[in-house]
Interface confidence: medium
């Protein structure tokens, strides 16, 4: 499919003047390549009339011009004083004009309305509001005042003064007569519909004597905006209809066969399935204006998209509307990611987030996607080191691999947390993506304690146990807070015990706090990973208190670190399932944290062991296929 | 329960300077993103710049890029604009307002996005 996208049909009037805008994506190729308009023939063919290297034709001598624009990936062609002989099939397109890199145009110039003297002419959009005025003299001021629409041969009266209203206009017009001192009655036509278009005749009177005036109303098919975004990207339709439908239902619809539009969101809370988890319908303001956020487009989202008011939320005849028709380009410069990661029960995922690598300093965040009234996208944590009070513990983003790829690694998972989730910078907007999580049947890889308590001035060991299909990767004990999570020495005691039908390749690393301090209470991480890439992820709760007498918990799980069998395990651990997960909540509640801020320090915390490096990553369920 | 209140407003001459302060005080202000309206007498409130809680993100209007500038200090409850370059059309009453953290998906630039108002401090620049 070609990738050239502009606009379908183009219409105008003989006389005028047409600008016609065609997209291409911006390559550097594309950005230098030529340019060209030309006309097909009908027996195949197309002959150029003007390109971006000069040429120009005869037949657009002194009344065209082609201008290309390479930082937006458009070019232009402005035609002027267009006759009926410009109607005809047209392509704009790059390179050479037979191979295939174009889009088709369509260019209707037909003849302007032929018009009576003294005729006033109403250009007016559909769904929106005319209002015909109609002088009358005095000798009129208390006689019958009529509208009447021509209708072939024949006058057919619209309206009149005695209350009389034309089935077709019922609910939508009306007649007023101006205040005494002025001689003008005007009739008011609301909602207007494409059949309205024609000429109407206003009568003062209904003699010889009654004055008369012509009106040419013109109602316009809104012309669509054309976009043109990349497949997997974010477009954003801006809605504005006007004040006076304000507190009418808001919608947006998408053109199938015909004059179908299937409503994709509305304000009275219908949603289409095709869009779930990727749509957001931002508030309308006070001026009747809203927008429309749709994010992962695909090649099925191309079309025509009309947006308007109606009591009903859908499109009906007579509903103010703006239209747009959206090109999704598949030469994407948004790499593929996973849309959908699973994720096992007590678990973890790690997600990769695309962004535009030209904006790396760009702030990222992470929100989830609320289906509620329509839509919001509350966030949950950002580059800066916020994370939201109940993420606390489980949720990290992190800068690694960067390059155009961030990630995002939320552990602990219960059935709550499957969703949709949207990845955001707050640069190019373009590049919101979408990733659904998914929580499956299974066990965690990783056995980790189910909680510790380390005693003041005592040394701690935590254990944590890696099944022998991890043997390939790096492991690692890091310790959370808001900005990442900081890597911590550990020790790679052997193979671990804690897995049936698990060779010598089953890893036990442990993580050893010497001198325990109040400071060491918190989150602790262990986790798997390849590079700059992340996998599986499992968390612990270390609770610090006074010494007490000996037998305290941890002690058995020095011991099970110490000589891990069976009977100790059972005891000491736990695989954590969903159930059982020590809530982060309760330890934000314990201590009143509002939400986690590192204030002293806003700058992002490393995790690799020793490095400076920024800690990245990838689902276990997609790892290194990058 | 975020309280604002808005100074530094007065009257320069065109292509003079003036800073505008906001400070916050109730709820915690450093969880906040923060913004900058202004409203001239017969015109709608509109937007004039934003900074994110951290101050690592800023968003202005066009009309104000490069002349404008905002800034918060976390430790000291408050959020600054540095207006440059003033001309006659900036005058207006202009009000701080501060946001509950929710939603990054619009970059508060909408004055409904907004849960706490200042007053509003005057500004006016004689030609």
């Known amino acids: 499919k070609s990738p050239i996208f502009g606009p379908e049909e183009v219409n105008s009037v003989e006389g005028n003047s047409v600008s016609i805008t065609c997209y291409y994506p911006p390559t550097s190729v594309n950005r230098h390549t030529r340019k060209y308009w030309c006309r097909q023939g009908a027996r195949g063919g197309c002959i150029t009339l003007i390109s971006s290297e000069g040429y120009v034709s005869s037949k657009y001598a002194g009344r065209a011009n082609l201008t290309n624009f390479p930082e937006n990936g458009t070019f232009v062609v402005n035609i002027a004083q267009l006759s009926q002989d410009d109607s005809g099939r047209y392509k704009c397109g790059l390179g050479i004009n037979s191979r295939g890199l174009s889009f088709d145009v369509s260019l209707e110039v037909s003849q302007g309305p032929g018009l009576l003297n003294d005729t006033k002419v109403y250009t007016v959009d559909l769904g929106r509001t005319v209002t015909i005025n109609c002088p009358f003299k005095t000798e009129n001021a208390q006689k019958r005042k009529s509208l009447y629409k021509q209708i072939g041969l024949y006058p057919v009266l619209v309206i009149d003064s005695s209350g009389y209203v034309n089935p077709n206009y019922t609910g939508r017009i009306r007649l007023d007569i101006q205040g005494t001192g002025q001689l003008l009655f005007s009739v008011v036509i609301n909602q207007l519909r494409l059949s309205d278009a024609g000429q109407y005749l206003c009568q003062a009177g209904d003699d010889s004597n009654s004055n008369k005036k012509n009106a040419d109303l013109q109602v316009l098919k809104p012309e669509p905006e054309l976009v043109y975004e990349d497949l997997r990207g974010s477009v954003t339709f801006h809605c504005a209809l006007g004040p006076e439908v304000a507190n009418v239902a808001k919608f947006l619809c998408r053109q199938s066969s015909g004059e179908n539009c299937d409503v994709v969101v509305n304000t009275l809370g219908k949603r289409a399935p095709a869009f779930e988890g990727r749509i957001l319908l931002n508030p309308q303001d006070k001026d009747g204006s809203f927008s429309v956020v749709i994010t992962g487009l695909r090649k099925e989202d191309a079309g025509r998209y009309l947006c308007g008011a109606h009591s009903d939320g859908q499109l009906q005849e007579g509903s103010p509307i703006q239209a747009w028709q959206l090109f999704v380009n598949e030469e994407s410069t948004i790499p593929r990611s996973p849309t959908v990661v699973k994720g096992v029960a007590g678990s973890s995922v790690a997600v990769l987030c695309p962004y535009n690598r030209k904006e790396s300093k760009s702030i990222k965040y992470w929100c989830l996607w609320e289906g509620a009234q329509n839509g919001r996208c509350p966030l949950l944590v950002d580059s800066e080191g916020w994370v939201k009070a109940q993420y606390e513990g489980r949720l990290s983003l992190l800068e690694e691999p960067g390059n155009g790829t961030f990630t995002v690694i939320l552990n602990q998972l219960t059935s709550r947390d499957a969703g949709f989730y949207w990845c955001l910078t707050n640069g190019d907007t373009l590049w919101r993506t979408t990733v659904e999580i998914k929580i499956i049947e299974g066990e965690p890889n990783l056995k980790v304690p189910g909680n510790v308590t380390a005693v003041l001035g005592e040394t701690l060991k935590v254990p944590c146990h890696f099944p022998c299909k991890f043997s390939s990767y790096e492991k690692y004990w890091c310790k959370w807070n808001n900005t990442g999570c900081q890597a911590l020495p550990s020790q790679d005691e052997g193979p671990s015990k804690a897995f049936v039908n698990c060779d010598e390749n089953s890893r036990l690393v442990s993580l050893t706090l010497n001198l325990v301090t109040r400071a060491d209470e918190g989150w602790y991480w262990c986790g798997v990973k390849q590079g700059h890439f992340y996998g599986e992820t499992a968390a612990v709760y270390v609770a610090v208190e006074e010494r007490k007498a000996a037998g305290s918990r941890d002690v058995s799980l020095a011991k099970a670190d110490a000589a891990p069998d069976e009977k100790v395990l059972d005891s000491g651990f736990r695989e954590i399932e969903n159930k059982a997960i020590q809530d982060p909540r309760l330890f934000a509640e314990e201590k009143a944290v509002a939400d986690t801020r590192d204030q002293a320090d806003g700058s992002r915390a490393s995790v690799d062991s020793g490095s400076s490096e920024e800690q990245g990553g990838s689902s276990r369920h997609h790892h290194h296929h990058h | 329960e975020v309280q604002l209140v808005e100074s530094g407003g007065g009257l320069v001459q065109a292509g003079g300077s003036l800073r505008l302060s906001c400070a916050a005080s109730g709820r915690t202000f450093s969880s906040n993103p923060m913004g900058w309206f202004r409203q001239a007498p017969g015109k709608e409130r509109e937007f004039v710049a934003a900074?994110?809680?951290?101050?690592?993100?800023?968003y202005y209007a066009d009309s104000v890029k490069g002349r404008f500038t905002i800034s918060r200090d976390n430790a000291k409850n408050t959020v600054t604009l540095q207006m440059n370059s003033l001309k006659p059309e900036d005058t207006a009453v202009y009000y701080c307002a501060s946001r509950d953290y929710s939603d990054p998906i619009s970059l508060w630039v909408e004055d409904r996005e907004y849960d706490y108002w200042g007053q509003g401090t005057q500004v006016t620049v004689s030609s």
């Open positions: 900074i994110s809680w951290s101050g690592g993100g800023t």
